[in-house]
């Protein structure tokens, strides 16, 4: 993990359960030092756009790829489980050229029937010259992308173009968007679930339906749990992310599929092409759209977005700006919580959740999105804690 937002100094890592700091050499060393034992269950991550499996080495105090030698599907499933994915989500494992790695974690097959991490040891060689790549869930795949369209003043999305997009209803009204990340979990914005809408029974999620008029209670999925980021600030909209767990899992098909959560090591470029989607208003102060709309936007550097003529230092590291400084294309009221996605390696990645902006599609007032990259650790922790 990128141990971000920790209260500990650079050299320490925070226990979720107690807030105490522990030495990185005690992290993933086979002995629980945190009261909740989480120092021993956050030892695995997927890195970069190729989903390279990395394991934390307490001796080296750093992350290392896992050598393919003697690796099998069961270990892959165990690693995915440790990240918070359920067994039945498991998609596939692959191998990737070790791409110049000089340091690996290798399996000691003679270690007997012990925990996967106790079987791993540090090695400077990998005879297969390949490292493990893991897909814990088949995510980020859509039918052909939507034609060029806009949320403010544009066209509708094509069926299956944004299969992770959900409409979240309260009182039979579309209130926010959300993104499917597993059959049970939806990412949305924390500002969507501020009191009194923090109660799960207020919410119904609709997936795979493009038109609002086709959404009726019986066709929706009730929400079991609403988890808002503990550091969400309603004034500044900092840490504006929340999770919803559905009462029963979605059935995936061409129109309902998950988006991929970004992996550490994925570098976002300024002006990177992204897409936003939602049923939000198609003009400022307008009504919710009947049909799902989508629009192309560009990422805007935080430094630029924080400039005096744009948002004047209101953008935190937990936020991303996207849109066009000249305006015209933007998310709007009702798009909140919905996805900001980008395509890399033919996979769609959730890099933002629609958060806030000054008006809609105004010049020098681009859309602001929760920076999902900063929250992946928190998301996996919630999924893992839910078991």
């Amino acid at each position: 993990w990128k141990f971000m937002g920790s209260k500990c100094s650079n050299s320490g890592i925070e226990c979720d359960s107690s807030g105490t700091c522990i030495n990185p050499s005690n992290w993933c060393d086979g002995v629980s030092h945190c009261p909740g034992g989480e120092d021993e269950n956050r030892c695995v991550r997927l890195y970069g756009p190729n989903f390279i499996l990395q394991v934390y080495s307490s001796q080296r105090k750093s992350w290392h790829p896992v050598c393919q030698d003697d690796w099998n599907e069961n270990y892959g499933r165990a690693a995915c489980r440790d990240m918070g994915y359920k067994n039945n989500f498991y998609s596939s494992q692959g191998i990737v050229d070790d791409s110049g790695s000089t340091s690996f974690m290798k399996l000691n097959t003679s270690a007997g029937n012990v925990d996967i991490y106790k079987k791993l040891y540090h090695s400077d060689a990998c005879s297969s010259k390949a490292v493990v790549s893991l897909r814990c869930i088949a995510c980020g795949v859509n039918l052909n992308s939507s034609r060029q369209s806009r949320i403010v003043g544009g066209e509708s999305a094509l069926p299956g173009a944004w299969p992770w997009q959900v409409s979240l209803h309260v009182q039979n009204v579309h209130v926010c968007g959300g993104s499917i990340i597993t059959p049970e979990w939806i990412v949305t914005a924390a500002h969507c679930v501020e009191k009194p809408l923090n109660n799960p029974w207020h919410w119904t999620a609709f997936a795979g339906i493009l038109r609002q008029s086709f959404m009726f209670y019986g066709a929706g999925y009730q929400v079991e749990k609403v988890i808002s980021h503990p550091n969400y600030d309603s004034k500044t909209k900092n840490n504006d992310i929340a999770l919803m767990k559905l009462q029963k899992p979605l059935t995936f098909n061409d129109l309902v599929k998950p988006v991929c959560l970004p992996n550490p090591g994925m570098m976002l470029q300024p002006e990177q092409l992204c897409w936003i989607s939602g049923w939000g208003a198609t003009e400022e102060k307008g009504k919710t759209s009947e049909v799902l709309n989508a629009a192309k936007v560009l990422l805007i550097e935080t430094q630029r977005c924080n400039s005096r003529y744009v948002y004047d230092n209101l953008i935190t590291p937990a936020m991303i700006c996207a849109g066009f400084l000249q305006g015209n294309v933007d998310s709007c009221q009702g798009d909140s919580g919905g996805p900001l996605v980008t395509s890399k390696n033919n996979i769609w990645w959730l890099i933002g959740d629609t958060s806030w902006g000054s008006g809609c599609a105004k010049a020098y007032r681009p859309g602001v999105y929760g920076n999902v990259m900063v929250f992946t650790d928190w998301i996996y922790r919630q999924m893992r804690a839910d078991g």
């Epitope: 309260v170 009182q171 009194p196 799960p200 029974w201 207020h202 009730q222 079991e224 009462q247 029963k248």
Partner: antibody
Framework: QVQLQQPGAELVKPGASVKLSCKAS????????MHWVRQRPGQGLEWIGI????????NYNEKFKSKASLTVDKSSSTAYMQLSSLTSEDSAVYYC??????????WGQGTTLTVSS | DIVMSQSPSSLAVSAGEKVTMSCKSS????????????LAWYQQKPGQSPKLLIY???TRESGVPDRFTGSGSGTDFTLTISSVQAEDLAVYYC????????FGGGTKLEIK
């Protein structure tokens, strides 16, 4: 049509427990939250708690947390409420009701619970 | 906790008369996101279970006669029966679902 069937009456002794049932029919039981409501003789309505039949997720009125326990049996489309350590104060009519959005659109006929030695 | 207060606690009217009853909440029940109120009205006839009349403060449940009208927003709500019929003899309860669920004490309607 939607129906919530509850037994008409239950007679139990003080200190005992009772499990009240609410059998749902005419709709997808696992899609809708189910509520329980109490009405003491000649009194108003009091909300006890809520359960989702698919996951078993519950939430209770603080007042009833140590008194009531909500469960479901998906196979028979039945919701249950167990009431423990019964006293005469628990004598009341207990209703189950289905939640649609945020209102109770269908109610059971109610079970009259009498706690008496 | 949100407290729901209903008034009057009882009233007696003749058939054909117009009736209004009030329900006040200790805090606003308006959902700013949907612009709907988390308030419903229920009718309970003697010996029967409650029946939904009005939800979201002013939306009439299907099958409910149009003489029943709900109005109000925020903290003050009213149920109006434009021309009372003998079968309207019942206790009427308001209920909030803004924060968990609370019923008002009820208004008993009697027919003279």
């Amino acid at each position: 049509q939607v129906q919530l069937q509850q037994p008409g009456a239950e007679l139990v002794k003080p200190g005992a427990s009772v499990k009240l049932s609410c059998k749902a029919s005419g709709y997808s039981f696992t899609t809708y939250w189910m509520h329980w409501v109490r009405q003491r003789p000649g009194q108003g309505l009091e909300w006890i708690g809520i359960i989702h039949p698919n996951s078993g997720t519950t939430n209770y009125n603080e007042k009833f947390k140590s008194k009531a326990s909500l469960t479901v049996d998906k196979s028979s489309s039945t919701a249950y409420m167990q009431l423990s350590s019964l006293t005469s104060e628990d004598s009341a009519v207990y209703y189950c009701a289905r939640l649609l959005w945020d209102y109770f659109d269908y109610w059971g006929q109610g079970t009259t619970l009498t706690v008496s030695s | 906790d949100i407290v729901m207060s209903q008034s009057p606690s009882s009233l007696a009217v003749s058939a054909g008369e117009k009736v209004t009853m009030s329900c006040k909440s200790s805090q606003s029940l308006l959902n700013s996101r949907t612009r709907k109120n988390f308030l419903a009205w229920y009718q309970q006839k003697p010996g029967q279970s409650p029946k939904l009349l009005i939800y979201w403060a002013s939306t009439r449940e299907s099958g409910v006669p149009d003489r029943f009208t709900g109005s109000g927003s925020g903290t003050d709500f009213t149920l109006t029966i434009s021309s009372v019929q003998a079968e309207d003899l019942a206790v009427y309860y308001c209920k909030q679902s803004y924060n968990l669920y609370t019923f008002g004490g009820g208004t008993k309607l009697e027919i003279k």
